[in-house]
Protein backbone atom coordinates (compact mmCIF):
# COMPACT_ATOMS: atom_id res chain seq x y z
CA UNK A 1 0.00 0.00 0.00
CA UNK A 2 0.81 3.90 -0.10
CA UNK A 3 1.65 3.49 3.41
CA UNK A 4 4.72 1.07 3.05
CA UNK A 5 5.90 3.06 -0.17
CA UNK A 6 6.68 6.08 2.30
CA UNK A 7 8.86 3.90 4.51
CA UNK A 8 11.43 4.70 2.16
CA UNK A 9 11.16 7.98 2.19
CA UNK A 10 10.25 8.47 6.00
CA UNK A 11 13.94 7.07 6.48
CA UNK A 12 15.84 9.50 4.08
CA UNK A 13 13.58 12.06 5.84
CA UNK A 14 13.77 11.75 9.10
CA UNK A 15 18.21 11.32 8.65
CA UNK A 16 17.95 15.08 6.79
CA UNK A 17 15.69 16.32 9.47
CA UNK A 18 18.18 15.14 12.20
CA UNK A 19 21.22 17.22 10.41
CA UNK A 20 18.85 20.07 10.20
CA UNK A 21 17.96 20.10 13.87
CA UNK A 22 21.77 19.36 14.62
CA UNK A 23 23.05 22.59 12.29
CA UNK A 24 19.90 24.28 13.96
CA UNK A 25 21.13 23.70 17.15
CA UNK A 26 24.62 24.91 16.41
CA UNK A 27 23.27 27.98 15.10
CA UNK A 28 21.01 29.08 17.40
CA UNK A 29 22.95 27.74 20.58
CA UNK A 30 20.60 25.18 21.47
CA UNK A 31 21.55 22.29 23.86
CA UNK A 32 19.75 19.88 26.18
CA UNK A 33 19.23 22.53 28.94
CA UNK A 34 18.30 25.32 26.81
CA UNK A 35 14.34 26.67 27.18
CA UNK A 36 12.13 26.60 24.65
CA UNK A 37 11.47 23.43 21.89
CA UNK A 38 13.84 21.25 20.97
CA UNK A 39 13.65 20.15 17.04
CA UNK A 40 12.23 16.75 16.40
CA UNK A 41 11.33 14.53 13.78
CA UNK A 42 7.69 13.70 14.69
CA UNK A 43 7.47 10.30 13.03
CA UNK A 44 5.54 12.84 9.88
CA UNK A 45 7.86 15.81 9.57
CA UNK A 46 10.61 17.64 10.75
CA UNK A 47 10.23 20.88 12.84
CA UNK A 48 13.40 23.03 13.88
CA UNK A 49 13.90 24.55 17.20
CA UNK A 50 12.27 27.33 18.52
CA UNK A 51 12.08 29.84 21.56
CA UNK A 52 9.31 30.04 23.87
CA UNK A 53 6.10 32.21 22.34
CA UNK A 54 7.94 31.13 18.74
CA UNK A 55 5.38 29.48 15.77
CA UNK A 56 6.66 27.22 13.26
CA UNK A 57 5.29 26.79 9.94
CA UNK A 58 6.44 24.32 7.93
CA UNK A 59 4.69 22.91 4.49
CA UNK A 60 2.83 19.53 4.27
CA UNK A 61 5.03 16.58 4.07
CA UNK A 62 6.00 14.72 1.41
CA UNK A 63 3.77 11.72 2.32
CA UNK A 64 0.51 13.70 1.42
CA UNK A 65 1.91 13.94 -2.06
CA UNK A 66 1.48 10.68 -2.18
CA UNK A 67 -2.21 10.65 -1.23
CA UNK A 68 -3.20 13.35 -3.30
CA UNK A 69 -0.63 14.28 -5.80
CA UNK A 70 -2.63 16.99 -7.30
CA UNK A 71 -4.02 19.33 -4.64
CA UNK A 72 -1.45 22.05 -3.78
CA UNK A 73 0.30 21.33 -0.55
CA UNK A 74 -0.63 23.54 2.68
CA UNK A 75 1.30 24.80 5.45
CA UNK A 76 0.74 23.28 9.09
CA UNK A 77 1.99 24.87 12.12
CA UNK A 78 3.37 24.31 15.37
CA UNK A 79 3.66 26.73 18.73
CA UNK A 80 6.43 26.65 20.99
CA UNK A 81 4.99 26.83 24.85
CA UNK A 82 6.41 26.80 28.37
CA UNK A 83 5.12 22.85 28.18
CA UNK A 84 7.01 22.50 24.67
CA UNK A 85 5.08 22.01 21.55
CA UNK A 86 1.34 22.41 21.09
CA UNK A 87 0.09 19.45 18.48
CA UNK A 88 -0.10 20.57 14.72
CA UNK A 89 -2.58 23.41 13.52
CA UNK A 90 -4.29 22.34 11.39
CA UNK A 91 -4.03 18.26 12.31
CA UNK A 92 -2.08 17.19 9.07
CA UNK A 93 -5.03 15.59 7.35
CA UNK A 94 -6.91 18.96 7.15
CA UNK A 95 -4.22 21.13 6.34
CA UNK A 96 -2.75 18.93 3.93
CA UNK A 97 -5.53 17.05 2.23
CA UNK A 98 -6.71 13.61 2.87
CA UNK A 99 -9.10 11.57 0.59
CA UNK A 100 -9.98 8.80 2.69
CA UNK A 101 -11.93 6.73 -0.19
CA UNK A 102 -9.28 6.93 -2.03
CA UNK A 103 -8.31 3.28 -2.89
CA UNK A 104 -4.70 1.75 -1.63
CA UNK A 105 -2.67 1.33 -4.29
CA UNK B 1 -19.79 3.95 6.62
CA UNK B 2 -16.88 3.92 9.30
CA UNK B 3 -17.67 1.18 11.58
CA UNK B 4 -16.42 0.83 15.56
CA UNK B 5 -17.45 -1.60 17.69
CA UNK B 6 -15.57 -2.14 21.35
CA UNK B 7 -15.81 -5.30 22.83
CA UNK B 8 -13.72 -6.66 26.45
CA UNK B 9 -16.05 -4.70 29.13
CA UNK B 10 -17.12 -6.47 31.97
CA UNK B 11 -16.83 -6.28 36.09
CA UNK B 12 -13.57 -7.13 37.12
CA UNK B 13 -11.84 -6.68 40.41
CA UNK B 14 -9.94 -3.91 41.77
CA UNK B 15 -5.66 -4.36 41.16
CA UNK B 16 -6.73 -6.87 38.11
CA UNK B 17 -6.43 -6.57 34.20
CA UNK B 18 -8.39 -6.30 31.24
CA UNK B 19 -7.78 -5.80 27.42
CA UNK B 20 -10.55 -4.18 25.54
CA UNK B 21 -10.88 -4.19 21.48
CA UNK B 22 -12.35 -2.14 18.70
CA UNK B 23 -12.95 -3.74 15.34
CA UNK B 24 -13.08 -1.01 12.78
CA UNK B 25 -14.59 -1.11 9.23
CA UNK B 26 -15.25 1.16 6.09
CA UNK B 27 -12.21 3.13 6.17
CA UNK B 28 -8.64 2.80 5.86
CA UNK B 29 -8.05 2.15 9.40
CA UNK B 30 -4.29 1.33 8.84
CA UNK B 31 -3.99 5.85 7.88
CA UNK B 32 -5.92 7.09 10.80
CA UNK B 33 -5.04 7.69 14.26
CA UNK B 34 -6.96 5.97 17.11
CA UNK B 35 -8.09 7.33 20.45
CA UNK B 36 -9.92 5.69 23.68
CA UNK B 37 -12.10 8.24 25.94
CA UNK B 38 -13.90 7.19 28.73
CA UNK B 39 -16.97 8.01 30.30
CA UNK B 40 -17.97 7.19 34.45
CA UNK B 41 -21.44 6.71 34.64
CA UNK B 42 -23.22 10.19 34.96
CA UNK B 43 -20.22 12.23 34.05
CA UNK B 44 -18.55 13.63 31.50
CA UNK B 45 -16.12 12.52 28.76
CA UNK B 46 -12.17 12.04 29.97
CA UNK B 47 -9.97 11.26 27.03
CA UNK B 48 -7.66 8.43 27.58
CA UNK B 49 -4.68 7.49 25.06
CA UNK B 50 -4.08 7.89 21.47
CA UNK B 51 -2.01 5.76 18.98
CA UNK B 52 -0.90 7.26 16.13
CA UNK B 53 -1.42 5.60 12.41
CA UNK B 54 1.74 3.14 12.76
CA UNK B 55 1.73 3.00 16.08
CA UNK B 56 4.99 4.61 16.41
CA UNK B 57 3.58 7.87 18.46
CA UNK B 58 1.40 6.89 22.08
CA UNK B 59 0.31 9.51 24.55
CA UNK B 60 -1.92 9.11 27.64
CA UNK B 61 -3.70 10.99 30.17
CA UNK B 62 -1.86 11.45 33.64
CA UNK B 63 -5.06 9.28 35.15
CA UNK B 64 -3.53 5.95 33.80
CA UNK B 65 -0.45 6.66 32.62
CA UNK B 66 2.06 3.13 33.91
CA UNK B 67 -1.01 1.53 33.88
CA UNK B 68 -2.42 1.50 30.51
CA UNK B 69 -1.22 0.43 27.18
CA UNK B 70 -2.37 1.48 23.79
CA UNK B 71 -1.28 -0.48 20.82
CA UNK B 72 -2.94 -1.77 17.43
CA UNK B 73 -2.77 -4.26 15.16
CA UNK B 74 -3.45 -2.90 11.57
CA UNK B 75 -3.71 -6.35 9.92
CA UNK B 76 -6.84 -7.08 11.43
CA UNK B 77 -7.89 -3.57 11.71
CA UNK B 78 -8.21 -3.65 15.44
CA UNK B 79 -7.33 -1.06 18.59
CA UNK B 80 -6.55 -2.43 21.84
CA UNK B 81 -6.05 -0.82 25.30
CA UNK B 82 -4.61 -3.26 27.59
CA UNK B 83 -5.88 -1.99 31.32
CA UNK B 84 -3.83 -3.34 34.42
CA UNK B 85 -4.28 -2.73 38.00
CA UNK B 86 -7.80 -1.63 37.78
CA UNK B 87 -8.83 0.96 40.09
CA UNK B 88 -12.51 1.61 41.02
CA UNK B 89 -12.30 5.26 39.99
CA UNK B 90 -11.75 3.41 36.24
CA UNK B 91 -15.38 1.97 36.29
CA UNK B 92 -17.03 3.53 32.94
CA UNK B 93 -17.66 3.13 29.31
CA UNK B 94 -14.69 3.24 27.00
CA UNK B 95 -15.25 4.32 23.52
CA UNK B 96 -12.89 3.82 21.13
CA UNK B 97 -12.98 6.27 18.12
CA UNK B 98 -11.36 7.52 14.93
CA UNK B 99 -8.60 10.45 14.92
CA UNK B 100 -9.05 12.21 12.18
CA UNK B 101 -4.95 12.87 11.30
CA UNK B 102 -2.27 10.33 11.30
CA UNK B 103 -0.79 11.43 14.42
CA UNK B 104 -3.51 12.56 16.77
CA UNK B 105 -6.09 14.48 15.29
CA UNK B 106 -9.42 15.06 17.08
CA UNK B 107 -12.02 12.46 17.10
CA UNK B 108 -14.48 12.21 14.73
CA UNK B 109 -16.23 8.93 14.71
CA UNK B 110 -17.07 7.00 17.66
CA UNK B 111 -17.90 3.61 18.65
CA UNK B 112 -20.90 2.44 21.05
CA UNK B 113 -18.65 1.83 24.15
CA UNK B 114 -17.87 -1.15 26.01
CA UNK B 115 -18.63 -1.08 29.93
CA UNK B 116 -15.93 -1.56 32.14
CA UNK B 117 -16.70 -1.94 36.29
CA UNK B 118 -14.16 -2.96 39.10
CA UNK B 119 -15.54 -3.66 42.30
CA UNK B 120 -14.67 -6.23 44.69
CA UNK C 1 -2.68 20.11 31.57
CA UNK C 2 -5.20 22.21 29.91
CA UNK C 3 -8.63 23.14 31.92
CA UNK C 4 -11.64 23.60 29.97
CA UNK C 5 -14.20 25.35 31.79
CA UNK C 6 -17.68 25.66 30.24
CA UNK C 7 -20.42 27.64 31.26
CA UNK C 8 -23.14 27.43 32.30
CA UNK C 9 -23.45 24.14 33.92
CA UNK C 10 -27.35 23.82 32.84
CA UNK C 11 -29.41 25.84 30.42
CA UNK C 12 -33.12 25.88 30.68
CA UNK C 13 -34.41 26.93 27.17
CA UNK C 14 -37.33 26.56 24.96
CA UNK C 15 -37.37 25.02 21.27
CA UNK C 16 -36.86 28.10 18.68
CA UNK C 17 -34.87 30.20 21.49
CA UNK C 18 -30.99 30.72 21.35
CA UNK C 19 -28.90 28.62 23.14
CA UNK C 20 -25.14 29.92 23.92
CA UNK C 21 -22.56 27.78 25.14
CA UNK C 22 -19.21 28.98 26.32
CA UNK C 23 -15.81 26.91 26.80
CA UNK C 24 -12.62 28.95 28.23
CA UNK C 25 -9.30 27.11 27.96
CA UNK C 26 -6.80 27.70 31.05
CA UNK C 27 -4.47 28.46 28.16
CA UNK C 28 -4.37 28.89 24.37
CA UNK C 29 -5.27 26.46 22.18
CA UNK C 30 -4.23 27.70 19.29
CA UNK C 31 -7.36 26.91 17.10
CA UNK C 32 -7.46 23.30 17.90
CA UNK C 33 -10.92 23.50 19.92
CA UNK C 34 -13.10 21.14 18.60
CA UNK C 35 -17.26 20.59 19.79
CA UNK C 36 -19.28 17.17 20.18
CA UNK C 37 -22.69 16.99 20.88
CA UNK C 38 -24.01 13.81 23.30
CA UNK C 39 -27.54 12.72 23.54
CA UNK C 40 -28.65 10.04 26.19
CA UNK C 41 -27.80 6.31 25.47
CA UNK C 42 -25.68 7.52 22.81
CA UNK C 43 -21.53 8.32 21.65
CA UNK C 44 -20.78 11.38 20.98
CA UNK C 45 -21.20 13.37 17.87
CA UNK C 46 -18.56 15.97 16.16
CA UNK C 47 -20.40 19.42 15.52
CA UNK C 48 -18.05 22.29 14.92
CA UNK C 49 -14.00 21.59 14.45
CA UNK C 50 -11.41 24.08 15.07
CA UNK C 51 -13.76 26.90 16.64
CA UNK C 52 -15.61 27.48 13.76
CA UNK C 53 -15.27 25.56 11.23
CA UNK C 54 -18.84 23.19 10.60
CA UNK C 55 -18.92 19.56 9.33
CA UNK C 56 -21.25 18.17 6.66
CA UNK C 57 -24.04 17.24 7.53
CA UNK C 58 -24.36 18.91 10.64
CA UNK C 59 -27.95 21.61 10.31
CA UNK C 60 -26.59 25.26 9.84
CA UNK C 61 -28.01 26.41 13.09
CA UNK C 62 -25.08 25.14 14.85
CA UNK C 63 -22.64 27.56 14.85
CA UNK C 64 -19.18 28.13 16.52
CA UNK C 65 -16.99 31.12 17.46
CA UNK C 66 -13.59 32.34 19.34
CA UNK C 67 -9.94 32.10 19.38
CA UNK C 68 -7.14 31.71 22.06
CA UNK C 69 -8.89 30.68 25.11
CA UNK C 70 -12.17 31.96 24.99
CA UNK C 71 -14.39 29.81 22.83
CA UNK C 72 -18.97 30.04 21.96
CA UNK C 73 -21.10 27.82 20.32
CA UNK C 74 -24.26 28.55 19.39
CA UNK C 75 -27.69 27.32 18.24
CA UNK C 76 -29.44 29.62 16.21
CA UNK C 77 -33.05 28.14 16.86
CA UNK C 78 -33.02 25.70 18.87
CA UNK C 79 -34.82 22.36 17.67
CA UNK C 80 -36.55 19.75 20.11
CA UNK C 81 -33.72 17.25 18.70
CA UNK C 82 -30.96 19.36 19.90
CA UNK C 83 -31.48 18.88 24.06
CA UNK C 84 -28.53 17.78 24.61
CA UNK C 85 -25.12 17.75 26.63
CA UNK C 86 -22.13 19.49 24.48
CA UNK C 87 -18.40 19.17 25.38
CA UNK C 88 -15.77 21.28 23.72
CA UNK C 89 -12.74 19.20 23.57
CA UNK C 90 -8.71 20.44 22.92
CA UNK C 91 -6.10 18.67 20.52
CA UNK C 92 -3.83 21.34 21.43
CA UNK C 93 -1.54 20.12 24.09
CA UNK C 94 -1.57 16.72 25.02
CA UNK C 95 -2.58 15.41 26.99
CA UNK C 96 -5.85 16.40 25.38
CA UNK C 97 -8.98 17.17 27.21
CA UNK C 98 -12.65 17.79 26.93
CA UNK C 99 -14.52 20.50 29.21
CA UNK C 100 -17.28 19.17 31.88
CA UNK C 101 -20.04 19.68 29.68
CA UNK C 102 -23.29 21.64 29.23
CA UNK C 103 -26.34 20.11 29.07
CA UNK C 104 -29.04 22.22 27.37
CA UNK C 105 -32.66 21.17 28.61
CA UNK C 106 -36.06 22.04 28.47
CA UNK C 107 -37.70 24.79 30.18
Known amino acids: GSMAHSDGIFKKEQAMCLEKIQRANELMGFNDSSPGCPGMWDNITCWKPAHVGEMVLVSCPELFRIFNPDQDMGVVSRNCTEDGWSEPFPHYFDACGFDEYESET | QVQLVESGGGVVQPGRSLRLSCAAS????????MHWVRQAPGKGLEWVAV????????YYAESVKGRFTISRDNSKNTLYLQMNSLRAEDTALFYC?????????????WGQGTLVTVSS | EIVLTQSPATLSLSPGERATLSCRAS??????LHWYQQKPGQAPRLLIK???QSLSGIPARFSGSGSGTDFTLTISSLEPEDFAVYYC?????????FGPGTKVDIK
Open chain 2, 97 to 109: ARGYDVLTGYPDY
Open chain 2, 26 to 33: GFTFSRFA
Open chain 2, 51 to 58: ISYDGGNK
Open chain 3, 27 to 32: RAVFGN
Open chain 3, 50 to 52: YAS
Open chain 3, 89 to 97: HQSSMLPFT
